[in-house]
């Protein structure tokens, strides 16, 4: 069964700056990953990037950098900065389009007991089948 | 399918200047890299520079301080600034895109053709 991992982790140079990984762990191929915050895109959340394999990369403020790690795997990099910017128990959630498996998503926030610049290991977060 | 279209290669005396551009037809995604590569008469094809959608940049040792690569993320374009030409510049000049940065799926211009003569 494929599943969907998320870490978050605020940087220790900016404590407002968070950066956060996410990664598929399935066979199919990924042709969409959307990251949003505040809840599952859809559902409440807010996008912050959309990461297509074949076209490209979008992003939205605070959102500074997003980018493929690997051919299953994406990192968010977030502004610190103004209205927008994060809060330690914010919610991120990242949702992969893969074929034939289908949309997955899980979400995750930075554990409570976290000190800047460390983060839990990433591991597969509680996973929601949408569709 | 991104398109991408080259334009502003031509001929020129050495020393002279040539901006090079390059369009996507991608309208709505950032291209993660875009870059500039060369083919000389008889080469093999060289990378020239390339540029990250956040503005990373990278050139090939004998071109650094006479090119610039440049892009415009609204309008998902590229440019290449050449100054200083020499005419061991003489070639044609295409335009790449990597949207994902992984190199899943390139794409490439047609190719315009830089010539440096007296």
């Known amino acids: 069964t494929p599943e969907v991992w998320v870490q978050v982790r605020m940087e220790a140079t900016e404590l407002s700056s968070f950066t956060i990984r996410c990664g598929f762990l399935g066979s199919g191929s990924i042709s969409l990953v959307t990251v949003s915050w505040g809840g599952p895109n859809g559902a409440g959340g807010t996008t912050l990037a959309v990461l297509h394999p074949e076209r490209g990369i979008r992003q939205w403020a605070p959102a500074r950098q997003a980018r493929w790690e690997t051919q299953s795997s994406i990192s968010l990099i977030l502004e610190g900065s103004g209205a927008s910017s994060p809060c330690a128990n914010t919610t991120f959630c990242c949702k992969f389009a893969s074929f034939p498996e289908g949309s997955w998503e899980a979400c995750g926030s930075l554990p409570p007991s976290s000190d800047p610049g460390l983060s839990a290991p990433p591991t597969p977060a509680p996973i929601l089948r949408a569709d | 399918e991104v398109q991408l279209v080259e334009s502003g290669g031509g001929l020129v005396q050495p020393g002279g200047s040539l901006r090079l551009s390059c369009a996507a037809s991608?309208?709505?995604?950032?291209?993660?890299?875009m870059g500039w590569y060369r083919q000389a008469p008889g080469k093999d094809r060289e990378l020239v520079a390339t540029?990250?959608?956040?503005?990373?940049?990278k050139y090939v040792d004998s071109v650094k301080g006479r090119f610039t690569i440049s892009r415009d993320n609204a309008k998902n374009s590229l440019y290449l600034q050449m100054n200083s030409l020499r005419a061991e510049d003489t070639a044609v000049y295409y335009c790449?895109?990597?949207?994902?940065?992984?190199?899943?799926?390139?794409?490439w211009g047609q190719g315009t053709m830089v010539t440096v003569s007296s």
């Open positions: 540029i990250t959608y956040t503005g990373s940049i």
């Open positions: 991608e309208t709505y995604f950032d291209l993660y890299v």
């Open positions: 790449n895109a990597d949207p994902s940065g992984l190199g899943r799926k390139v794409y």
